[in-house]
């Protein structure tokens, strides 16, 4: 029996969400992140595409670049040089991987209102950026780095060995981009532009993943990507620094790797400039439980970089891997040697520490059974950070200020009481010296972006409040959402439940579990969303639940590191445990329970379906991992160790989806994958399908030709329509 949706005349005028609403992005929201260019000025692209400079203190704004100029080169992005003399305009955007893309760049001279002619930039460029001071340019073209003193000058070629799929200079290879740096670039200007640091990645010995790209031609193309899977040969990384004023003097100088790191396979994890002549590099052993932070100084006499052992700081985890998803990066204080950093305290919670000489002598700045998430800014007297401390909800984010100029340091929550019901999940963006900052609230109410005074925290103005969205939602029957927790065997399982608009506890509803569950992830967050699951609750009367089990983040190391070296066990167990608890609540139709997930979530949903519990009637896996031997080394080995006999091969073999093929016999399984998935290769689903066929297990499948891990564009519409049909059929809901 399906619950009736109409209760009174007022609700008659309201309508449920439709799938079309979701696919058209009808209820998407806007955020406002100022493009700060000084302590009190920011740039913003106006609704009519002019680039406008706003001065907070004078209240004045003026157009620095007209939409006409933007349109003349079809620019989709821009970047103002710090001396405000030039703007680069980016067009012909061509996506590569998650962060990387190539583009054509034009330089516009603001002083004469003309494009710079002569010594134009080559095309397409892989990365381009201004120096932090003046208008020097660094760019990467065909895997080599070039420097320009000024936009109209000829370039100086810094590297010469760049080669497609072999040597990458100033840009990461696939695995570093996706799993380590999370950027499209691997070069870093020193604060005043004196030096340029860059990474060189040598992929010569890395095995290549090859897949067909069908396109429209008679013969498909083969895409080849050096992609180290678990246990395979990894990229060899080197860091160089070049003097940008005298680049040909001694040329690029290599920064030495700490001896304890260089003794075996290792990664470079991040670079942070401290001053023009001091740089901080972070390195990580291939077995990712030891990280070394190394502070290096420029030796003028030798023109080299010296990294004394006394300036090496070791971070080691004895219970899991180093850091959270990534090892945290330091935020240096004004003395240019001490820094603030987030790492686990003795109780196993990630907190801010102040390191002056050694990690052992670190002073803990925050503490409690919650976690510090991000350090936004350190000024002379304040440290701004985000945490999930407030009211003990791990899925919230509030911004705090600690006064570091006074003793004892006082702590103030900047956001906790601003718009308490509407806003519980914030991020922030600070101007120079934290003179002003923008707060961006993501929910649970309609998102809102506001501008604040950095000294008083006073709200100056609303930057974006999504009024149109608010009005559009007035006649929509949105589902109800609740965030609660289950206490099971000393484990706290936070969950978010999305309930149909006229939810009635005395009735029975079909349940859909949406799972991700990857290490250091968090699904249960106090954020606003009108998406596919909102529609399923609003229109189709389903209850949807998201559960953060073991392995998820921001609740301490005990929960986070529980999955160390045994992926695919506890994440699945905890989803099953939660389902059993939901059934006990009395409003779930236990004959109509489904689970779905994407990527890591596809892996967990597949394992849950094959758990043999009989709880799930059906489920969907989109682009799932099926064996950890098929996934990237950097990610996989962080959590699983190596697939070798003397390490963790046994669990690699035990944790595959294929090993459970028989158990799919009693569930309806929909397997979906893009054939051009560069991340979780189609191989994963191909192997599941093969195992199911070999076991003579019926299942449904859908592939998306030439689509990557995101299944974007028209594929998105097809995907969600297809999954909707599948679920409605599974739950016996009429179309």
């Amino acid at each position: 029996l399906r619950p009736s949706r109409v209760h009174n005349s007022e609700e008659n005028t309201m309508r449920a969400l439709t799938l079309k609403d979701i696919l058209n992005g009808t209820f998407s929201y806007k955020t406002f992140f100022p493009n700060w260019i000084s302590g009190q000025e920011y740039l913003h692209q106006s609704a009519d595409n002019n680039i406008v400079l706003y001065n907070i203190e004078t209240g004045q704004s003026y157009t620095i670049l007209s939409n006409r100029t933007m349109k003349s080169v079809n620019a989709s992005n821009y970047g103002l040089s710090p001396d405000r003399q030039f703007v680069y305009l980016e067009s012909d955007y061509s996506k590569l991987w998650r962060y990387s893309y190539t583009a054509t760049y034009y330089i516009y001279d603001l002083s004469n209102g003309e494009f710079v002619r002569g010594n134009e930039l080559p095309r397409p460029i892989q990365y381009l950026c201004w120096s932090p001071v003046g208008s020097k340019l660094a760019y990467v073209y065909q895997n080599n780095i070039y420097l320009k003193q000024r936009p109209g000058d000829p370039p100086f070629q810094i590297t010469f060995n760049g080669r497609e799929n072999k040597i990458f200079n100033g840009i990461p290879d696939w695995v570093y981009e996706e799993e380590m740096l999370a950027t499209k670039y691997a070069l870093w200007w020193s604060p005043n532009g004196k030096f340029l640091a860059y990474a060189e990645f040598n992929d010569t010995d890395i095995p290549v993943i090859a897949y067909s790209y069908y396109g429209d031609e008679q013969y498909p193309r083969t895409i080849n990507i050096p992609y180290p899977k678990a246990g395979a040969k990894n990229p060899v990384v080197r860091i160089f620094i070049i003097d940008t004023t005298y680049p040909a003097y001694v040329g690029p100088q290599e920064v030495p790797v700490p001896a304890m790191i260089a003794s075996s396979d290792y990664y470079f994890s991040w670079l942070t400039w401290v001053t023009d002549e001091r740089v901080c590099l972070q390195w990580l052993k291939r077995v990712q439980n030891v990280s070394v932070l190394s502070i290096c100084d420029f030796r003028e006499d030798w023109q080299t970089w010296d990294c004394p052992k006394t300036q090496e700081h070791i971070e080691e985890s004895r219970t899991g891997w180093a850091g959270g998803f990534f090892v945290s990066t330091p935020v240096f204080s004004y003395d240019a040697i001490s820094y603030y950093k987030i790492f686990s305290d003795k109780d196993g919670y990630k907190h801010i520490h102040y390191i002056k000489d050694t990690v052992e002598n670190a002073i803990q700045i925050t503490s409690g059974k919650w976690e510090a998430i991000n350090i936004f800014r350190v000024t002379q007297d304040s440290l701004f950070y985000s945490s999930n401390e407030f009211e003990e909800y791990p899925g919230r984010r509030n911004i705090y200020r600690i006064s570091i100029g006074s003793y004892p340091p006082s702590k103030k929550c900047v956001t906790c009481h601003l718009r308490k019901e509407r806003c519980q999940y914030y991020t922030a963006s600070f101007s120079d010296y934290a003179k002003y900052y923008a707060l961006v609230c993501y929910g649970p109410g309609i998102p809102i972006s506001t501008l604040h005074d950095g000294r008083t925290d006073q709200e100056i103005k609303i930057l974006e409040e999504n009024k149109e969205l608010e009005n559009a939602l007035k006649n929509i029957q949105l589902p109800k959402e609740e965030i609660k927790k289950l206490e099971v065997d000393e484990i706290t399982l936070w969950y978010k439940m999305i309930l149909p608009p006229q939810f009635d506890r005395s009735k029975k509803y079909p349940l859909l579990i949406q799972v991700y569950g990857g290490p250091c992830s968090q699904s249960v967050r106090s954020v606003f969303a009108v998406n596919w699951i909102s529609y399923l609750a609003s229109k189709e009367g389903m209850v949807i639940a998201l559960v953060d089990g073991r392995g998820t983040a921001f609740q301490g190391d005990k929960l986070l590191y529980a999955v160390y070296r045994k992926l695919g066990v506890y994440e699945v167990e905890d989803q099953i445990t939660a389902v059993r608890k939901f059934i006990e609540m009395g409003f779930i139709d236990e004959k109509r329970i489904a689970i779905w997930g994407w990527s890591y979530g596809g892996y967990v949903s597949s394992l849950a379906l094959a758990s043999g519990t009989g709880l799930f009637k059906c489920g969907i896996a989109v682009a799932p991992v099926s064996s950890w031997e098929y996934y990237a080394s950097v990610y996989t080995e962080r959590f699983m160790g190596l697939p070798t006999k003397d390490d963790n091969l046994e669990h690699y073999k035990n944790s595959t989806v294929m090993a459970r093929a028989e158990y799919f016999r009693n569930v309806d399984y929909l397997l979906i994958h893009g054939t051009a998935d560069d991340n979780v290769h189609f191989q994963n689903s191909a192997q599941i399908a093969k195992a199911l066929v070999n076991a003579q297990v019926d299942f449904q499948a859908m592939w998306y030709s030439d689509q990557n891990h995101g299944l974007s564009g028209l594929s998105t519409n097809h995907l969600y329509t297809h999954m909707t049909h599948f679920l409605k059929q599974c739950f016996s809901l009429s179309d």
Epitope: Q149, R150, F156, F160, T245, Y246, P247, A248, Y249, V250
Partner: antibody, heavy 118, light 107 residues
């Protein structure tokens, strides 16, 4: 348009001094390494000295080290070469040139002749 | 200091000829090699920088190649205005040095 104009050349006795100037225009002078290059009559080119953008860093050919001093005034967009203890072998046309990236001379002045003779 | 040796020191050629001048460095200078043209009574003019890059405004008949210690300047089809002296110059270590020059004369 980039322009470099030298001045200050002339006849000087051995052991004497001379100060050359180079007025720069058409580019952001303070952002570049500047240099002096000389050419003795009927001979090839010889680099003399360079100075960094801020003026704090300099370099000299062995043949002039300790006798010549290069300097600049970024507020006036002017490069200087103070030549002391001049010798007959310093006789040459002295060119002011922009030393792009410390590597190549992309713009040159027309030159100023310095003659050291008794 | 890095010595630069140019050859030949002079050559005679006709309009339309392909002309090649070589330059050898006493040690490796990577691609930090530049070529200049100088006409009598005039300042030198940059033709090629970084071994093979054509300076803006220079005709495409001029080309450069090489890396390490051996470099070449080629004029694919000599024009009347190309009769001049050509110098190579290395740009390593902030100690620029020039070759002795190659005089290209009319045959």
């Amino acid at each position: 348009e980039v322009q470099l104009v030298e001045s200050g050349g002339g006849l000087v006795q051995p052991g004497g001094s001379l100060r050359l100037s180079c007025a720069a225009s058409g580019f952001t002078f303070r952002g570049y390494i500047m240099s002096w290059v000389r050419q003795a009559p009927g001979k090839g080119l010889e680099w003399v000295s360079w100075i960094g953008p801020e003026g704090s860093r300099t370099g000299y050919a062995d043949s002039v080290k300790g006798r010549f001093t290069i300097s600049r005034d970024n507020s006036k967009n002017t490069l200087y070469l103070q030549m002391n203890s001049l010798r007959a072998e310093d006789t040459a046309v002295y060119y002011c040139a922009r030393l792009q990236y410390g590597t190549w001379f992309d713009y040159w002045g027309q030159g100023t002749l310095v003659t050291v003779s008794s | 200091d890095i010595q630069m040796t140019q050859s030949p020191s002079s050559l005679s050629a006709s309009v339309g000829d392909r002309v090649t001048i070589t330059c050898r460095a006493s040690q490796s200078i990577s691609s930090y090699l530049n070529w200049y043209q100088q006409k009598p009574g005039k300042a030198p003019k940059l033709l090629i920088y970084a071994a093979s890059s054509l300076q803006s405004g220079v005709p495409s008949r001029f080309s450069g190649s090489g890396s390490g210690t051996d470099f070449t300047l080629t004029i694919s089809s000599l024009q009347p205005e190309d009769f001049a002296t050509y110098y190579c110059q290395q740009g390593r270590l902030l100690l620029p040095t020039f070759g002795q020059g190659t005089k290209v004369e009319i045959k």
